[in-house]
Every structure is written in structure tokens, then in C-alpha cells.
Amino acid sequence: AWELTILHTNDVHSRLEQTSEDSSKCVNASRCMGGVARLFTKVQQIRRAEPNVLLLDAGDQYQGTIWFTVYKGAEVAHFMNALRYDAMALGNHEFDNGVEGLIEPLLKEAKFPILSANIKAKGPLASQISGLYLPYKVLPVGDEVVGIVGYTSKETPFLSNPGTNLVFEDEITALQPEVDKLKTLNVNKIIALGHSGFEMDKLIAQKVRGVDVVVGGHSNTFLYTGNPPSKEVPAGKYPFIVTSDDGRKVPVVQAYAFGKYLGYLKIEFDERGNVISSHGNPILLNSSIPEDPSIKADINKWRIKLDNYSTQELGKTIVYLDGSSQSCRFRECNMGNLICDAMINNNLRHTDEMFWNHVSMCILNGGGIRSPIDERNNGTITWENLAAVLPFGGTFDLVQLKGSTLKKAFEHSVHRYGQSTGEFLQVGGIHVVYDLSRKPGDRVVKLDVLCTKCRVPSYDPLKMDEVYKVILPNFLANGGDGFQMIKDELLRHDSGDQDINVVSTYISKMKVIYPAVEGRIKFSTGSH
């Protein structure tokens, strides 16, 4: 028998520094978690003690904090190199700055293989990107070899900016021939490492012949055997065992997100490369694990540029940006309009001639807008200003909802109107009319939404049975502010970009902004 220890991370999303327990900014260091310095301590401890250790990342290192905004992926390459990762799969967010924003800072600088079998380059890009990422890599581990085959969500063109010269194929269809190729090379221990979400991870385990282990990401899935050590509730046991179509027991793992845990999976193989046993658990990277001093010193060195950046001007406003709770929790506010416009702009993807865009709608809880920005400071807007408006370090995500769910959400928006509660929705690509004289649950009298399958966007009445794409804060996607119907009824959920980053990018792009209150949200009384 031969033992392999797989250490894995996924969806780290730019959390290079330690964070609070909820993965936001670290406030009380004695209770903080994660970060690359702490991760390195744990990884090195395991490497020193155990044989045959692989450190793998299942994608989405990019995007999530000011680290990515400023360093644009150079920080990922630098610190992943320092931690001596053995391989990484491409996630959808690795394409957020376009293909160039992946090639230059990461693909060219990484000292470890970066993998995806289902991304195929075409046209002029094919030669430019050739060899910079691979479908698979055979890694020597001790006296044996292990094949790692990568995959990436085929939804990436809708979630990021991969451009027109990358084709995202079906994961299973693309993986099988690569696994077959590894088998012909006498590689009999094969790990599928990828970023398509837990449901696809399980399908790969079931359908792709020859895959021994699946290490996934994208869905931020927390698996655990026994009593979980923090707030995350397990979606199943670690590892999650899938019985493949050819009768093998295939372990599937994921390690939540944000570098809070280090996945730890111990696999025992027989001499023919069959998995005899698998066990382990994610390791909570809490403050009992010290931060490695040399990595921490490096983090502090890189940190200096971030502090400078946060006070630099991103753009100007020539109007007062009303982010006050007195406005945003009671009526349409222009800060809400600005943020929603930025959210839609960040999701412009012309992937189909029939659609001007794949998504046109935004909703945003007014309680998530925490500060106004005064234009009388020479109109200057800085990252620091935006951090006061959006202090929670959330993301703006893409969901698919039925019209009926949206209607319920808008009813919830005003079900206790007048109490300055956070659930009042700011919008984009939506015209809503409320009649507050009606009883709660029946106050939405008009709900029109901007078409997507049209050359000239216009507002049409919401259809209850139609499925719509909507951009919203992850807080709402997770049922926050009482929006349980969104969490319970959403048909798809893909995590998006850091909230501040979305707005800052938009302001930088527009240079001068002047959002207005323009009748997106109206109130009527009596018959409509």
C-alpha cells in the first residue's frame, strides 16, 4: 500500500491576510483565522512529518479583497510560489481581468502547473497561451507518480471575462480522454482538480472512468466528519463518497472558502492504483496555529502599497451620493442606483447575438448601504470612501430565480415599511410600484423588468413562471435580511466579484458620475 496526503484549498478569494471568523477584515488578531502565513505553518508542519504530500488549489484565488484590486494576480503567484503549491486548477474568477490578466501575472509567473482540460484556446490566443496552462500534469510524489487533471466551470463566459478565443467544453466530455491518456502513460493514481461546484464534482466522480479522487471548488462546500470546529454547517461527510458507474468508491472533497480551512485527505492506494481507504477532515486554521514569521514579514512588505492605494482618487462625483439610511431604507436613493448600475455593468457579457446581455436586473438591500459620499470634497471618491459605504466585504453574485420568487422578495421589501429596516430593496433594471395602503404581502402593484432578449432594452411586466437572472449581494443570496425565499427558491447561484471592487471599477471607468433618483421605485395609493 502507498499513502498520499492531499492538502487542498479552494475559493481563497484574495484572503492573503488573516481574517475574522466570518472571513471579513481581521479586527481582533487573537481570534483571527486563515491567511497565507498561517496556512504555510500548517502545510510545512505536515510536510515535515508526513511522506507524499501534495498541496493543491481548486481555483478562484483571484478576486475578493483590495489585494487583488491592487496587485491583480501578482500576489497570487508570489505567495502560492512561496507556499510551494504543487498544482492549481483555473477557476472562473481567474478570468476577471481578461485572458491577459491571467497570462501575465499568474500563468507566466507560477512555478507550479495550472490546469484545465475543458478550456480550449482558438485563434491567435492558441499560440500565445500554449503551454501556460495544461489539461493535466504528472507529478512525481516520493517513489510514485500522480496524475492531476484540471477542469473549470463551463459557465465561466457568463461569470467572468474569458473573451471569445477560449471555448469552455463540458467537463465530463473533456476530462475522459485526458484521463484515458494518463492511463496509457501508466499513471494509475489520478486526481481530478477543478472548479465547477459540488454537484459537478460528484458527477465527475460518478462518470469519469479512472478518476480516483475529486478535489473541487466553486460552491464553497463545507464537508466535515464529526463535530465541526467553527460556524460552517457541513453539507456532508468528509470525504464525500460517490459510487462510480463502474462500481468504485470515489472520495470527493472541498474545503469551504477564503482560506479558513486547509483540506486534509489521506488516501491509501494499492499497487494497482486503486483507492483502499480515504479519510481526513478540513483543518480549521485558527489562532492556535502561529503565522509563519518569514511569510508574515513578506505580507507586511506587500501590504504597504495597499494602504497607499486606498487613499488615491478613483474618480469624481458631481452630485451628493445619498447613502443615508433615511433615504436608502425608505425610497429610491441615488447611491443604490449607482451601486446597481455598477453591478450590471460588471456583468456585461455579450455571449449570444439574441441577447444584448445575459442579465439586466439588480436588487440590493438598502441596509447594506452604510454611508453617503459628499461631493463637496472636490468630488473625490477613494477606495476608503467606498469601504465606508460597503464595509462588509461581500460579493455581488449572479442568481437565477423564478418571477414568483422575485415578487415575494419585493413584497418582503416593504412588508414592514416605515421602521427603517434594511430589507427595503434598491434596484436596477426594475421598475416597481408599491401601494402601502394594502396589507403586507400584497403591496406590489406593478413590477416591470428590463428585457434581455431584445436589441432595444425596454420594461415588460414580470412573468411569474419565467426564470430570470439577477445580480444581488451574497448576503441576499444567502437569505439575509429575511429574504429566505431567495435562498430557498434560487435555481442557481454563482459567487461574483468583491462589492467594493465592482463599484470602484465602475467609477474608474466612468471617471465622473452623477447618479439620479429617476423613478425606479414608486409609491401609489388606491387603484393602480
Epitope: 508526513e50 511522506p51 492556535s288 502561529p290 509563519d292
Partner: antibody, heavy 118, light 106 residues
Framework: EVQLQQSGPELVKPGASVKMSCKAS????????LHWVKQSHGKSLEWIGY????????GYNQKFKGKASLTVDKSSSTAYMELRSLTSEDSAVYYC???????????WGQGTSVTVSS | LLVLTQSPAIMSASPGEKVTMTCSAS?????MNWFQQRPGTSPKRWIS???KLASGVPARFSGSGSGTSYSLTISSMEAEDAATYYC?????????FGGGTKLEIK
Amino acid sequence: EVQLQQSGPELVKPGASVKMSCKASGNIFTDYYLHWVKQSHGKSLEWIGYIYPNTGVNGYNQKFKGKASLTVDKSSSTAYMELRSLTSEDSAVYYCASDSWFFAMDYWGQGTSVTVSS
Amino acid sequence: LLVLTQSPAIMSASPGEKVTMTCSASSSINDMNWFQQRPGTSPKRWISDTSKLASGVPARFSGSGSGTSYSLTISSMEAEDAATYYCHQRSSYPWTFGGGTKLEIK
């Protein structure tokens, strides 16, 4: 400062088994890997295996598989090594040694002397 | 099994003399650790990761090397340095120790 206190010397007959202990104090016992090392009289050191008290995961030098068995009792912060089917070749001093967060075998017990004699 | 061969097996040095002992690996490794053991006591971590001195180790000690060849050097021998020194690798499983170099004071 981490301290590892090992059990006293053992005189055992050939074919018998022996179980020695290594009690940790001064650290979070479960957080550090613990190793066992053999030193025959006047000879060098031989690594036997490791155990990670947190999970009970262990690994062995192939040479000692079947000879040594490593276990832990988290409640008493104590690691154990049992040696089976003893022969004169097993007469030696056996050390437990703990990794720290940053270094291999940073802390050592005082050793347990095992003498196999009829 | 990766074999570590230490040389010389036994050596003696006068106080103030420079001392170098070597450890040769049967195949290339990433790092070397060194332990000091005085008679009747447990080994002590002396040098980690090829060149990092353990806390309390005098600055006259140094470690260097790469690939298959590593060494421990004492710039100026002192009486308290008399001991046996073992090299130890964790690059290839199972972890192994060298046969030791016994350093005596003249």
C-alpha cells in the same frame, strides 16, 4: 516550553511485548506531530514512525511495520508505542520526539531503555 | 531507502580549531537537519533546514550544502562542543539519520 516525559526502563523476555509511554506537557498536545526513534547501544538513530494526536493519523518506517504500534490518549496527553515479538535486536533506547510548529523533532523525551533478555 | 553517510566517523580537534564534518546523501535532497547528542542524554535539535541554528546554539556553528552534499562547521572548537552529531533528512521517506560523527576535544 514543551516537555516529554517517558516511562521507565523495561526488562522483557524474548517473544514478549512491551508498551512504553510518552506524556506531553507545556503545549497543545494534539497540535504537534510526535515521532518515535530507536537508538541501539553505541549506534545511530533510526526513525520508527509518527503519530498526529489530533487525528490519530500515523505512519511507519516499513522496517518497523508489524513490530511497532503507535497510539495516543488525547485526554491524558500521552502517546504510546507498543513493540511486539521482541528479540535481542530490539534492545535499545527508544525516544519520543515532538515537532514544533516550525521545526522537526524540536523536543525529545529522556528515552526509555528496553532490554530483551531471557 | 535514502542513505546518509557521515564522515569522518570520529574526529578530534583542539580548542580554537576550525571543524568541518560532512553528510553525503545517496540521492539529492532539499534540506538537512543536524542533531547533537552528548553521552547519556537525548539528542538536541542543532541545525534545521540546512542552515538555521536552533535557539541557544552558539554562532560559531554553521550549516551549509545542497543536493547530495551537506556540512556542519564549527569556526572555533570549544570543549563543550565535544559530542556526537547526526545528520537527518526529511526529503525522502522513510526519514533517515546518518551514522554520526563523534567529535572529541584534544
